[in-house]
C-alpha cells in the first residue's frame, strides 16, 4: 500500500537498518526510497525538546510486515518509502536549506557570487554530493562568499548542524543539470586499476555500470565476467573512484570490462531498471519466499509485486510436475545485489522491476519499428503529438513531443496569431488524423511558454513548451522521449528520424498518416554554407540529404527530430525552418534541444 503523507510527532519503533543525516523529512523519505531495503523511516526535526545531536537524523528501517509499532514522540516525523508506490520517483532535490551546515569532507573551497553559483559548481564537479555556502552576512569576514564542495561515502551528510548565515544544498546531477560528460562506452578487456570503494555481484557489465551510477561514490567500474580466470572473482563488480575523477591506469586484461558511472546521463538512460533475464544463472541471497510460477516472466512479476523482493531465481518445472509450474525463489540482500552468482544449474534469474519507476519513463524500450517505408505504424513514435487549433476550424497546426506527463515541447513559431491556449487541443497516441473525431479525447492546454528571446524561426530560439491541463497516463502509444544529456554534446547521432503529418511537397496538404523519414545530420559549418543569408548558430542543428528528397515540410513544425543512441531515443531537434522542402543542398533547420535543456528544466520544474 502506498502511503505518501508524513506522520508528525510519530516514531517507528525498531527495524533500524542505518542512520543517515538529512536536512528534511521529505529528503529522508527519498533516501529511504533509494536504499535497497528501507521501507519506513523516522526523522528527527530540530526541536528544543530534542537533543541537538539527534536533530536531522534519518533512521532507515525495514520490517517483514512492512510496518512497525508507532510511538508518540515530539519532533519525530515518520513515513514510508515510495517503493510501495507506483508513481514516478526522482532523487532531484533543488531545495536550499537556510542556516544549516551539512557536514562532509570539504575537498574544495572557492569564492562564489551566490548560493546558486555554488550549487552549479557542485553539480559540475564529479565528486560533489552537496555544498555549504557562507553568505555575505556570515560573521567571519574571510569565510564570506565561500563555497565548500563536499562529499561523503553515502552521498548524505555525516552530520547537520545549525549555523547562522550559511545555506546548504545538494548537487543537481540527479536533476539532469550537470555539464559533465556522459561516457556510455563499456571498454572490453580492460581493468581500471584504482581504489575500490565497494564491490557487488552482477550478472553482466551493464548491471555493474548501473549499480555504479546510483552508488554515491562510484565514478567508474571494472567487471569480471563469468569467464574470468580467477573463479572467486567471477561476476564481481568493482566500484571505483580516483582523485582526478578518471581512471589513472588502464590494464589490458581479457574477460574484464570497464566503464564509467552514468550519473551525468541518468535521466536519459535506465540506471535502476535491470529488466533482462539471465538464463542458466542462479542468484543467491536471503530467501524471502518460494512460490509456484508458470514462467520466469511470471516469477519476475511476483518479485516486482513483493515490495521486499530485490531479485529472483526461477527453476523451470520438471515435465508434468506441479501443473507445469516451476519454483520462483524471491530473494533479497543487504545491498540489493545477489551475494553470489552461480552458472550451469538451470535457473533463470533477474531483478525486480519495482525500481524501474526511479528511471525516467522515456528510457523504456518501445516496440521495434518498421524499417523503410514512409508511413509510420501505431506506437512507433509514442512521444509524437498532433497539436490542433480550433480556429477558424479544427485542424492540425503543428507537431510536438511529450517530454513529461504534463509537458509538450514544440516550436515557438507555431503560435503566431494564437490568441489563447484555450483554443488548442493536443492529441496523443494518434497515427491517422482521420481517427480524430468530435468525441476523441484530447488534452487542453493550460499555458503556452515561448522562449522570451524568440522573434522568428530563422533567428533561433524557436522553442516552446505547452503545459497541459491534465496529466498524460503513459501507455505503449503515448509516452515521453528523453531529452539529450548536456554531457552528450559531442555525441555523433547516426540514426535520426523526422516525423510528422506535414506536407509531402511544398504545395500539398496535411497527411492523414504520420510520416517518417530517416535523415542524416549535417554539420553546422556545412549548413551555414547552404544558408549564406542566415546565421546558423550552435543553438540550431541541421539535417538533410545533399541531393534533397527527404525533409520536414509545412505542418511538421514543432515535431521531433528523434535520434536513437544506445537503444534510447532522444529528442535532438525540433522542426523549425528551411528553404522550401527537401530541396537539393537545403537541409532542414531544427532547434538544437541540448542547448535548451536548462531552459526546459527551469520552466518544467518551476514550483
Amino acid at each position: 500500500e502506498c502511503v505518501t503523507q508524513l506522520l508528525k510527532d510519530t516514531c517507528f519503533e525498531g527495524g533500524d537498518i542505518t542512520t543517515v543525516f538529512t536536512p528534511s523529512a521529505k529528503y529522508c523519505q527519498v533516501v529511504c526510497t533509494y536504499h535497497p531495503r528501507c521501507l519506513l523511516f523516522t526523522f528527527t526535526a530540530e526541536s528544543p525538546s530534542e537533543d541537538p545531536t539527534r536533530w536531522f537524523t534519518c533512521v532507515l528501517k525495514d520490517s517483514v510486515t512492512e510496518t512497525l509499532p508507532r510511538v508518540n514522540r515530539t519532533a519525530a516525523i515518520s513515513g514510508y518509502s515510495f517503493k510501495q508506490c507506483s508513481h514516478q520517483i526522482s532523487a532531484c532535490n533543488k531545495d536550499i536549506y537556510v542556516d544549516l551546515d551539512m557536514k562532509g569532507i570539504n575537498y574544495n573551497s572557492s569564492v562564489a557570487k551566490s548560493a546558486q553559483e555554488c550549487q552549479e559548481r557542485c553539480t559540475d564537479d564529479v565528486h560533489c554530493h552537496f555544498f555549504t555556502y557562507a553568505t555575505r552576512q556570515f560573521p567571519s569576514l574571510e569565510h564570506r562568499n565561500i563555497c565548500l564542495l563536499k562529499h561523503t561515502q553515502t552521498g548524505t551528510p555525516t552530520r547537520i548542524t545549525k549555523l547562522d548565515k550559511v545555506v546548504s544544498g545538494f548537487s543537481l546531477k540527479s536533476c539532469a543539470l550537470s555539464n559533465l560528460a556522459c561516457i556510455r562506452d563499456i571498454f572490453p578487456n580492460t581493468v581500471f586499476a584504482d581504489s575500490n570503494i565497494d564491490s557487488v555481484m552482477a550478472p553482466d557489465a551493464f548491471v555493474c555500470g548501473r549499480i555504479c551510477t546510483h552508488h554515491p561514490g562510484c565514478l567508474f567500474f571494472t567487471f569480471f565476467s563469468q569467464e574470468w580466470p580467477k573463479e572467486s572473482q567471477r561476476n564481481l563488480c568493482l566500484l571505483k573512484t580516483s582523485e582526478s575523477g578518471l581512471p589513472s591506469t588502464r590494464i589490458k586484461k581479457s574477460k574484464a570490462l570497464s566503464g564509467f558511472s552514468l550519473q551525468s546521463c541518468r535521466h536519459s538512460i535506465p540506471v535502476f531498471c535491470h529488466s533482462s533475464f539471465y538464463h542458466d544463472t542462479d542468484f543467491l541471497g536471503e530467501e524471502l519466499d518460494i512460490v509456484a510460477a508458470k514462467s520466469h516472466e511470471a516469477c519476475q512479476k511476483l518479485c516486482t509485486n513483493a515490495v521486499r523482493c530485490q531479485f529472483f531465481t526461477y527453476t523451470p518445472a520438471q515435465a508434468s510436475c506441479n501443473e507445469g509450474k516451476g519454483k520462483c525463489y524471491l530473494k533479497l540482500s543487504s545491498n540489493g545485489s545477489p551475494t553470489k552468482i552461480l552458472h550451469g544449474r538451470g535457473g533463470i534469474s533477474g531483478y525486480t522491476l519495482r525500481l524501474c519507476k526511479m528511471d525516467n519513463e522515456c528510457t523504456t524500450k518501445i516496440k521495434p519499428r518498421i524499417v523503410g517505408g514512409t508511413a509510420s505504424v501505431r506506437g512507433e513514435w509514442p512521444w509524437q503529438v498532433t497539436l490542433h487549433t480550433t480556429s477558424p476550424t479544427q485542424r492540425h497546426l503543428c507537431g510536438g513531443s511529450i517530454i513529461g506527463n504534463q509537458w509538450i515541447l514544440t516550436a515557438a513559431h507555431c503560435f503566431y496569431g494564437v490568441e489563447s491556449p484555450k483554443i488548442l487541443r493536443v492529441y496523443s497516441g494518434i497515427l491517422n488524423q482521420s481517427e480524430i473525431k468530435e468525441d476523441t479525447s484530447f488534452f487542453g492546454v493550460q499555458e503556452i511558454i515561448i522562449h522570451d528571446q524568440y522573434k522568428m524561426a530563422e533567428s533561433g530560439y524557436d522553442i516552446a513548451l505547452l503545459k497541459l491541463e491534465t496529466t498524460v497516463n503513459y501507455t505503449d502509444s503515448q509516452r515521453p522521449i528523453c531529452l539529450p544529456s548536456k554531457g552528450d554534446r559531442n555525441v555523433i547521432y547516426t540514426d535520426c528520424w523526422v516525423t510528422g503529418w506535414g506536407y509531402r511537397k511544398l504545395r500539398d496538404k496535411i497527411q492523414n498518416t504520420l510520416q517518417k523519414a530517416k535523415i542524416p545530420l549535417v554539420t553546422n559549418e556545412e549548413c551555414q554554407k547552404r544558408y549564406r543569408g542566415h546565421k546558423i548558430t550552435h543553438k540550431m542543428i541541421c539535417a538533410g540529404y545533399r541531393e534533397g528528397g527527404k525533409d520536414a515540410c509545412k505542418g511538421d513544425s514543432g515535431g521531433p527530430l528523434s535520434c536513437k543512441h544506445n537503444e534510447v531515443w532522444h529528442l535532438v531537434g525540433i522542426t523549425s525552418w528551411g528553404e522550401g522542402c527537401a530541396q537539393r543542398e537545403r537541409p532542414g533547420v531544427y532547434t538544437n534541444v541540448v542547448e535548451y535543456v536548462d531552459w526546459i528544466l527551469e520552466k518544467t520544474q518551476a514550483v
Epitope: 477558424p392 479544427q394 491556449p421 496538404k509
Partner: antibody, heavy 117, light 107 residues
Framework: QVQLVQSGSELKKPGASVKLSCKAS????????MHWVKQAHGQGLEWIGN????????NYDEKFRTRATLTADTSTSTAYMHLSSLTSEDSAVYYC??????????WGQGTSVTVSS | DIVMTQSPSSLSASVGDRVTITCKAS??????VSWFQQKPGQAPKLLIY???NRYTGVPDRFSGSGSGTDFTLTISSLQAEDVATYHC?????????FGQGTKLEIK
C-alpha cells in the same frame, strides 16, 4: 440535442444600437467557437466575427470591427452581438452558428433587425 | 480576403436530373469548404464539410468534391424538396467568406 435559440425581432432607428442574444444548449458552450453571420434580404451570407467563450478570444471581419462587439456569458451559455451606429444597411437577418468540429453545424433561427426612421 | 465565386447564380432543373453547382476560391483553401442548403424563411443547414464529407442525416444524393481552388456540389437525382438556395463557404482563413448563393428551382 444541440440548440441555438436567438432573441426576437428588433426595430431600431438609425444611429441606435442593438444587442442580439443566442442561447446555447445541449453541448459544452465553452468548447466551441460561436460565429455571427448576416444575411440581407435576398442576399448571400456575410461573416461578421466569432468568439471563443472559454477565453473571450474574438475575430472580426474588418467591415464590422469598429461597430460589432461579441461577448459571451458562460454562466448562462449565451452569446451576444452588440451592433452600434445602425444604418439602413444593417437591416438583415442575423444568425448565430456554432463552429463544430469542421464546419458551422448548428444555426440559430435568426433574428430580424430592421433599421428605419 | 478570399473571394468565393459561386456559379450559376440560379438554375432550373427537372426532378431526377443531375445538378452541379461550382464554387471557385480566389486562392488555395485546401479542403476547408462547406456547402449549406437554405430554404425560404429558414436558417442555413450544413450539407457537406471538408469539401467532400456528407454531414450526418444528409441524403446520399448530395456529394461534394474538389480541393485547392475548385469545388463542386452535386445532386445526383434532384428531388422536389431540394428546392432551396445553396451556399458555399471557406473556413481556411479569416475572414470567413461565402459564395453569393445559387438559387435552385424545379422546372
Amino acid at each position: 440535442q444541440v440548440q441555438l435559440v436567438q432573441s426576437g425581432s428588433e426595430l431600431k432607428k438609425p444611429g441606435a444600437s442593438v444587442k442580439l442574444s443566442c442561447k446555447a444548449s445541449g453541448y459544452t458552450f465553452t468548447r466551441y467557437w460561436m460565429h455571427w453571420v448576416k444575411q440581407a434580404h435576398g442576399q448571400g451570407l456575410e461573416w461578421i466575427g466569432n468568439i471563443y467563450p472559454d477565453s473571450d478570444s474574438t475575430n472580426y471581419d474588418e467591415k464590422f470591427r469598429t461597430r460589432a462587439t461579441l461577448t459571451a456569458d458562460t454562466s448562462t451559455s449565451t452569446a451576444y452581438m452588440h451592433l452600434s451606429s445602425l444604418t439602413s444597411e444593417d437591416s438583415a437577418v442575423y444568425y448565430c452558428t456554432r463552429m463544430g468540429f469542421y464546419a458551422m453545424d448548428y444555426w440559430g433561427q435568426g433574428t430580424s433587425v430592421t433599421v428605419s426612421s | 480576403d478570399i473571394v468565393m465565386t459561386q456559379s450559376p447564380s440560379s438554375l432550373s432543373a427537372s426532378v431526377g436530373d443531375r445538378v452541379t453547382i461550382t464554387c471557385k476560391a480566389s486562392e488555395n483553401v485546401v479542403t476547408y469548404v462547406s456547402w449549406f442548403q437554405q430554404k425560404p424563411g429558414q436558417a442555413p443547414k450544413l450539407l457537406i464539410y471538408g469539401a467532400s464529407n456528407r454531414y450526418t442525416g444528409v441524403p446520399d444524393r448530395f456529394s461534394g468534391s474538389g480541393s485547392g481552388t475548385d469545388f463542386t456540389l452535386t445532386i445526383s437525382s434532384l428531388q422536389a424538396e431540394d428546392v432551396a438556395t445553396y451556399h458555399c463557404g471557406q473556413s481556411y482563413s479569416y475572414p470567413l467568406t461565402f459564395g453569393q448563393g445559387t438559387k435552385l428551382e424545379i422546372k
